[in-house]
């Protein structure tokens, strides 16, 4: 349905509050360095303009596209050239090239100071005195640090953030109430950001077909009672929503997400028996709930997959007539029967099946050629099963911190050219897979482990893309989305790497180490471990374990000393010398 004014249409659909919040998120994700006040000014100007268009859709400029309106507004920022350098050149372009240019300048790791959490009383005062500004600051700070955060979901997080302050600022012990809630929101927010980053990467780097295939697998697992027609509808709408959000079209994205939620709730009977509770909630909670809904029970009477995809005489005919539909159906049928498989494994199976049909349907005896195709799936299935078994055993043996260290050593040896902060961050996140997934029942372990690893490895890929240093990382990241994890798993020690020269500064520690939180201390130790491996890539795990134990003892000893700084200055070089000997 055509609207005279797109901005008026979205303002009316979303309402003023959501409209303003989404425009703030959009601007903050594009101009990540701009001060909060500058963004608020831009948002207010856009909102006032939108209101004039609601009053009269034929008013001047109201017929312009949202990209044109928002881009023009962003290009009025006076310090664009000084703050953003060549991003200012985007403003010389016309739409749609201008928006594409802005998108290309989004920075996954912006140079911003880490967020410091003020005292609880300070936060509560700020919340109570200026609630609206306080919440908008939250949106701004998260959006600028996570330029691909799923915007309608960020509004949901802001709602949870508000609820936490509303409840806890009236509690007897504000801190005990608030801090755990903020920690949980922070962790959930980081996870949500990383998951969305993978969706955007899959759309932008591998195209709509790749995203749709992934969505067919996930939606079919969630809604095994839905027919393929219904799954196709949900997947098509979902793809539109994520394409819009990943493309910076946040108003359209939020509006279409609300429409999809409405459709799903109106069609629960043909989708899933698990949607009822979600559909009783208000909009933001409803959409969040639907996105995280548990898998429905599998229908009891599903016939054998081999009937249609191996035994049928029409396999090649059906495949040739409509390849995408036939493959979509295969993926749907396989996925709804296998909630115990990861989405990535299901996509690999579909890829293997398609490759077999391509080969066999061109032969004189197609059926004889593809008769054993399902047997070829066995090694593909066993690979992630072994990955889960092996890594969960390690996690149970070591615990999270030592498991992270094990992974850090493993990945530093695979790709030693990658920067130490990136290796530490990625390995820490990879290690969290144990805590998140290994306690799950057997049937949920593989989807949890492998799909989580895909999210984390995508973080490595996007960080590496910003400053590429390793051909091996580039290869694993770009060749195949579904084979990224197996590609990284298969990497052996990089024998071509020349050990990094020893730098005493890297292994010099001070008394400030003692005042760090446990997490910060771990990061410091893990940074030293990665540097150690880069210096001595041939070191065995046993040798590294010994050095790390010595290091932990050294920190503990000096942090108990009366003159901490003197202890670090004196004992540090001794530790380095002993480590050099141990690793010789």
């Amino acid at each position: 349905d055509a609207h005279k004014s797109e901005v008026a249409h979205r303002f009316k659909d979303l309402g003023e509050e959501h409209f303003k919040d989404l425009v703030l998120v959009a601007f903050s994700q594009y101009l990540q360095q701009c001060p909060f006040e500058e963004h608020l000014k831009l948002v207010n100007e856009v909102t006032e303009f939108a209101k004039t268009c609601v009053a009269d859709e034929t008013a001047e400029n109201c017929d312009k596209s949202l990209h044109t309106l928002f881009g023009d507004k962003l290009c009025t920022v006076a310090t664009l050239r000084e703050t953003y350098g060549d991003m200012a050149d985007c403003c010389a372009k016309q739409e749609p090239e201008r928006n594409e240019c802005f998108l290309q300048h989004k920075d996954d790791k912006p140079d911003l100071p880490p967020l410091v959490r003020p005292e609880v009383d300070v936060m509560c005062t700020a919340f109570q005195e200026h609630e609206d500004t306080f919440l908008k600051k939250y949106l701004y700070e998260v959006a600028r640090r996570h330029p691909y955060f799923y915007a309608p979901e960020l509004l949901f997080f802001a709602q949870k953030y508000k609820a936490a302050f509303t409840e806890c600022c009236q509690a007897a012990d504000k801190g005990a109430c608030l801090l755990p809630k903020l920690d949980e929101l922070r962790d959930q927010g980081k996870a949500s950001s990383a998951k969305q980053r993978l969706k955007c990467a899959s759309l932008q780097k591998f195209g709509e077909r790749a995203f749709k295939a992934w969505s067919v697998a996930r939606v079919s697992q969630r809604f095994p009672k839905a027919d393929f027609t219904e799954v196709t509808k949900v997947v098509t709408d979902l793809t539109k929503v994520h394409t819009e959000c990943c493309h910076g079209d946040l108003l359209e994205c939020a509006d279409d997400r609300a429409e999809l939620a409405k459709y799903m709730c109106e069609n629960q009977d043909s989708l899933s028996s698990k949607l009822k509770e979600c559909c009783e909630k208000p909009l933001l909670e409803k959409s969040h709930c639907l996105a995280h809904v548990e898998n429905d029970e599998m229908p009891a009477d599903l016939h054998a997959l081999t009937d249609d995809y191996v035994e049928s005489k029409d396999v090649c005919k059906n495949y040739a007539e409509a390849k995408d539909v036939f493959m979509g159906m295969f993926l749907y049928e396989y996925s709804r029967r296998h909630p115990d498989y990861s989405a990535m494994l299901l996509l690999r199976l579909a890829k293997a099946y398609e490759a077999t049909l391509e080969k066999c349907c061109a032969t004189a005896d197609p059926h004889g050629c593809y008769a054993k195709v399902f047997d070829e799936f066995q090694p593909l299935v066993e690979d992630p099963q072994n990955l889960v078994k092996h890594n969960c055993e390690l996690f149970e043996q070591f615990g999270e911190y030592k498991f992270q260290n094990e992974l850090l050593v493993r990945y530093t040896k695979k790709v030693p050219q990658v920067s130490t902060p990136t290796l530490v961050e990625v390995s820490r996140n990879l290690g969290k897979v144990g805590t998140k997934c290994c306690k799950q029942p057997e049937a949920k372990r593989m989807p949890c482990v492998e799909d989580y690893l895909s999210v984390v490895l995508n973080q490595l890929c996007v960080l590496h893309e910003k400053t590429p240093v390793s051909d091996r990382v580039t290869k694993c990241c770009t060749e195949s989305l579904v084979n990224r994890r197996p590609c990284f798993s298969a990497l052996e020690v990089d024998e071509t790497y020349l050990p990094k020269a020893f730098n005493a500064e890297t292994f010099t520690f001070h008394a400030d180490m003692c005042t760090l939180s446990e997490k910060e201390q771990q990061v410091k130790k893990q940074t030293a471990l990665a540097e150690l491996v880069k210096h001595k890539p041939k070191a065995t795990n046993e040798q590294l374990k010994t050095v790390m134990e010595d290091f932990a003892a050294f920190v503990e000893k000096c942090c108990k000393a009366d003159d901490k700084e003197a202890c670090f200055a004196e004992e540090g070089p001794k530790l380095v010398a002993a480590s050099e000997t141990a690793l010789a």
Partner: nanobody, 118 residues
């Protein structure tokens, strides 16, 4: 090539019954959602009813609920629409349609005319 052939239309009095049939060929019938769409004189297309591939779930427009029954026989590649208690407003061309995505259809037949008149 996909073909859908409707039959069973005709002239019937208000309150009467008709059974429409649709024979399908050129695709794997049991894989697809099938339905009936109608177009009354001077009006747009309207979904009347649809049925899932395995026949376990059916949808009916509010205007026909309780009067029309959709069914399918996958072994015969045939779709049916049993229409009871027919009304003058049911007069339309009825098309058998193959659906690839909920709310849309990619193929439909030539149609069969149903006229309800005294």
């Amino acid at each position: 090539e996909v073909q859908l052939l409707e039959s069973g239309g005709g002239l019937v009095q208000p309150g009467g019954s008709l059974r429409l049939s649709c024979t399908a060929s050129g695709f794997t019938f049991r894989h697809y959602r099938m339905g009936w769409v109608r177009q009354a004189p001077g009006k747009g297309l309207e979904w009347v009813s649809w049925i899932r591939p395995d026949g376990t779930f059916t949808y009916y427009a509010d205007s026909v609920k309780g009067r029309f029954t959709i069914s399918r026989d996958n072994s015969k590649n045939t779709l049916y629409l049993q229409m009871n208690s027919l009304r003058a407003e049911d007069t339309a061309v009825y098309y058998c349609a193959k659906s690839y995505m909920a709310g849309t259809f990619d193929y439909w037949g030539q149609g069969t005319l149903v006229t309800v008149s005294s």
